[in-house]
Interface confidence: medium
């Protein structure tokens, strides 16, 4: 017996009880694909989920967030709980940063501010919970000879600026 | 509510094509097969084939060879090609939606019919 | 192609009277079989599909049974709107076939 369902469009599903009759896809399901015999159901964005696409016959429907959380995971497949910048999720809710860590997002782990001494540097801009510090120029480069408006403050290594 | 509407010539010459369209109004044509079926006069009904929205189609194997139908999505309309005719396709044409998935393809929606004669 | 016949072809009866039109297919069809009403002059009306499921809008005098090759529509107590002709079509294979009609007249 010849294969009809490879003629059946996205969209639609082959109908085995019915000598492969092709049909639209059920309310809430679809089918990306030609071909199929079943018609996958449509994703729910319920809860902490939002909808960003609507489900339709030939595609799934997409989720985001709502306000306070942020997609993880393929396709938005989780939804975490924002954190302000300067902290960080743990399993008892968001915490600041540790002293000499930062994080300058909504999301994510804090990380340790960088140490300009490794590269050489100087610490130009002192290191906050939501912010790295920023590396200034070597100690070579601040020579007698170089030209500088004002005197260059002294190096701090990373974890002596205030909180 | 959705209704139907065929439009197309009454009167078609022997060998030439009859052409008929039907458009879609109070819905939307997408997510549905249609079909073309026709009743020649104090006789039965014909299912003549369907067209879904992505416009794969089925033809009855009596008319394939002279049936071409296609779909215009943004005029919400379907169209009914049938060449070469002859006398013996004079008939009232209908166009029906296939009432999608739980009514198993039973017509649901018809349009009121439009008549087709064949004659020099 | 699945060959469907009705009988009776005609029937003649009376306001009130219980009717009922047989169908038969060439070929099982399970329940893939719907019923159609068409007064002269207009087009067909669905009335009863997958063999019972009562359209909606359809008076609940008209029930559907059956499954396989034979199958019923039955109008429990005809009224005057209900003289016309009475089709079955199958959808179980392509193409999609009718049955030949059964007229319901006035006795």
């Known amino acids: 017996l010849q294969d009809l369902c490879s003629n059946c469009p996205a969209g639609t599903f082959c109908d085995n009880n019915r000598s492969q009759i092709c049909s639209p896809c059920p309310p809430n399901s679809f089918s990306s694909a030609g071909g199929q015999r079943t018609c996958d159901i449509c994703r729910q964005c319920k809860g902490v989920f939002k909808t960003r696409k609507e489900c339709s016959s030939t595609s799934n429907a997409e989720c985001d967030c709502i306000s306070g959380y942020h997609c993880l995971g393929a396709e938005c497949s989780m939804c975490e709980q924002d954190c302000k910048q300067g902290q960080e999720l743990t399993k008892k809710g968001c915490k600041d940063c540790c002293f000499g860590t930062f994080n300058d997002q909504k999301r994510g782990i804090c990380r340790p501010w960088t140490n300009c001494s490794l590269d050489g540097k100087s610490v130009l801009v002192n290191g906050t919970k939501e912010r790295d510090v920023v590396c200034g120029p070597s100690p070579a480069d601040l020579s007698p000879g170089a030209s500088s408006a004002t005197p260059p403050a002294p190096a701090r290594e990373p974890g002596h600026s205030p909180q | 509510q959705v209704q139907l509407q065929e439009s197309g010539p009454g009167l078609v010459k022997p060998s030439e094509t009859l052409s008929l369209n039907c458009t879609v109004s109070?819905?939307?044509?997408?997510?549905?097969?249609w079909s073309w079926i026709r009743q020649p006069a104090g006789k039965g009904l014909e299912w003549i084939g369907r067209?879904?929205?992505?416009?794969?189609?089925n033809y009855n194997p009596s008319l394939k060879s002279r049936v071409t139908m296609s779909v215009d999505t943004s005029k919400n309309q379907f169209s009914l090609k049938l060449t070469s005719v002859t006398a013996a396709d004079t008939a009232v044409y209908y166009c029906?939606?296939?009432?999608?998935?739980?009514?198993?393809?039973?017509?649901?929606?018809w349009g009121q019919g439009t008549m087709v004669t064949v004659s020099s | 192609d699945i060959q469907m016949t009705q009988s009776p072809s005609s029937v003649s009866a009376s306001v009130g009277d219980r009717v009922t039109i047989t169908c038969r297919a060439s070929?099982?069809?399970?329940?893939?079989l719907a019923w159609f009403q068409q007064i002269p002059g207009k087009a067909p009306k669905l009335l009863i599909y997958?063999?019972?499921g009562l359209q909606s809008g359809v008076p609940s005098r008209f029930s559907g049974s059956g499954s396989g090759t034979d199958f019923t529509l039955t109008i429990s107590s005809l009224q005057p709107e209900d003289f016309a002709t009475y089709y079955c079509?199958?959808?179980?294979?392509?193409?999609?076939?009718f049955g030949p009609g059964t007229k319901v007249d006035i006795k």
């Open positions: 067209i879904y929205t992505s416009g794969n189609t």
């Open positions: 029906a939606r296939d009432g999608n998935w739980n009514y198993a393809d039973a017509f649901d929606i």
């Open positions: 997958t063999a019972s």
């Open positions: 070929q099982g069809i399970s329940s893939w």
């Open positions: 109070g819905g939307s044509i997408s997510n549905y097969y």
């Open positions: 079509q199958q959808t179980n294979s392509f193409p999609f076939t």
